[in-house]
Amino acid sequence: CRTSECCFQDPPYPDADSGSASGPRDLRCYRISSDRYECSWQYEGPTAGVSHFLRCCLSSGRCCYFAAGSATRLQFSDQAGVSVLYTVTLWVESWARNQTEKSPEVTLQLYNSVKYEPPLGDIKVSKLAGQLRMEWETPDNQVGAEVQFRHRTPSSPWKLGDCGPQDDDTESCLCPLEMNVAQEFQLRRRQLGSQGSSWSKWSSPVCVPPENPPQPQVRFSVEQLGQDGRRRLTLKEQPTQLELPEGCQGLAPGTEVTYRLQLHMLSCPCKAKATRTLHLGKMPYLSGAAYNVAVISSNQFGPGLNQTWHIPADTHTEPVALNISVGTNGTTMYWPARAQSMTYCIEWQPVGQDGGLATCSLTAPQDPDPAGMATYSWSRESGAMGQEKCYYITIFASAHPEKLTLWSTVLSTYHFGGNASAAGTPHHVSVKNHSLDSVSVDWAPSLLSTCPGVLKEYVVRCRDEDSKQVSEHPVQPTETQVTLSGLRAGVAYTVQVRADTAWLRGVWSQPQRFSIEVQVSD
């Protein structure tokens, strides 16, 4: 027999199947051109000294063989003597170590058995009514296919599934979607309605994330506010990585979980933009404002649960940096300017009240004045900080106010609003004898003392009503008592107390008259 022909004689080895576990398997045969055919198979076991024979039986009952030698692939033409338009039965016999091993048979019509490809190129994955939908372009000239899929998770073996018959230029498959674990999918195809046609190879892995992206388990820390009025947000703990099935480890497009950082600046609500979303890897600098920070995890199916933190405002105050002058036309604040063309946000809120009650004002971009100061003025009619109470003031600055992460804190301080000099007047001044020539003067704390850093000192004035001599005694802002000594018995005195701020002299309290009684000796 010629090697190119199927030999219609008995093969050159005894006809006996050893029934061993090794041997030929997975025989596939198909047409590869208008007149050429190919069969290929796998051989399990030691390959040394193995000879393979492709056997073929025609519908007439006549059988022939091709000698393939040690190869596990064989090509032949339509001139080889094999009927290609009618059904034939093919199998492989492998002769090794004086025994014959047989593959399972395949029965097919060779002419219409086309080598089907698995889905090639881009397999689009989407979610449809709680299931996974895969879609791909049908390989060229291969419309009409049966499609199967197999899938596994990191902890489960392959499971087989059926996509059903396909008959279009695009093919698709509905597959199960796992809620919380990643899956690896592979697809294969075979010719539709062709008896005994072989399955294609499995496609490349399609890696699919869980329906719910994992909740980010991260922790943040915030550094101290620096000289530039900014503090760094740092990630203390990276998000945990998703466990992947074997074929998705390494490069696994499709299973990526992206973590985004959403910043919401709570302070200074009058600015243009309050929120900004960043990649988690790019940790921002923040001003000393209060922020809410959310980490949002998302995959190709959309966002998952987020984790939210509150970053409180930095309450470190600069008691001297802010100058406030109160005039008849209104009030003006002065502070050291940051740079040219800066926008400032001045925020104030009554102390001890909810942060939601903060009020703010945004300045137009301004350059420093000749003294290097920035200013903000308001009239009495505006009502800003008009009530006689303590306000917490924070000033933020930015050269790019539309960019949330470029704000910095200029200063934080306290200010007593309204008519501070009158409102701060100490009340309940009382005088008690202390000794033969001294008295103790007490008073209730000034309202200014509720405003940290605002009350510079108390001044106690004592006036001798006889000689009209006046003495003034400065008292620490934390004290509400002073001892006046060197007084004369029987002389009438008046005492008054006032509370001063750094920029404002207080109003004296109502005069309090007293005298030290003359002691009569027995």
């Epitope: 290609v84 338009l85 002419y111």
Partner: nanobody, 124 residues
């Protein structure tokens, strides 16, 4: 004597249709597999379509699948090839062939009986 005669060839426009007939005489062809082949100038004879004796099974070359249809009328001892959506590359001499051995091949030398052929020309 045994004879196969093709007819129905001619000139057609691209996109047009032709119907070829193959009449058999001299023996009963109703027991034979029948096929159409074609040969363009300077090329080898190529398989076009095949029909088994009962008309239960048909096969087509990839280049004509969906455009050509083979059929037979055993009472009239005739085989047909309906050609639609013709293309310039379909231009060739078309031959009718018979395989009494039912071998089921696309190789022209396996066929025992042949007609003289009919010319089909498709102009663009």
């Amino acid at each position: 004597q045994v004879q196969l005669v093709e007819s129905g060839g001619g000139l057609a426009q691209a996109g047009g249709s032709l119907r070829l007939s193959c009449a058999a005489s001299g023996r009963t062809f109703s027991n034979d597999d029948m096929a159409w082949f074609r040969q363009a100038p300077g090329k080898e004879r190529e398989f076009v379509a095949h029909i088994d004796r009962n008309a239960a099974s048909t096969n087509y070359a990839d280049s004509v699948k969906g455009r050509f249809t083979i059929s037979r009328d055993n009472a009239k001892n005739t085989v047909y090839l309906q050609m639609t959506r013709l293309k310039p590359e379909d231009t060739a001499v078309y031959y009718c062939a018979a395989d009494p051995d039912h071998f089921g091949t696309t190789w022209y030398q396996q066929y025992t009986y042949w007609g003289p052929g009919t010319q089909v020309t498709v102009s663009s």
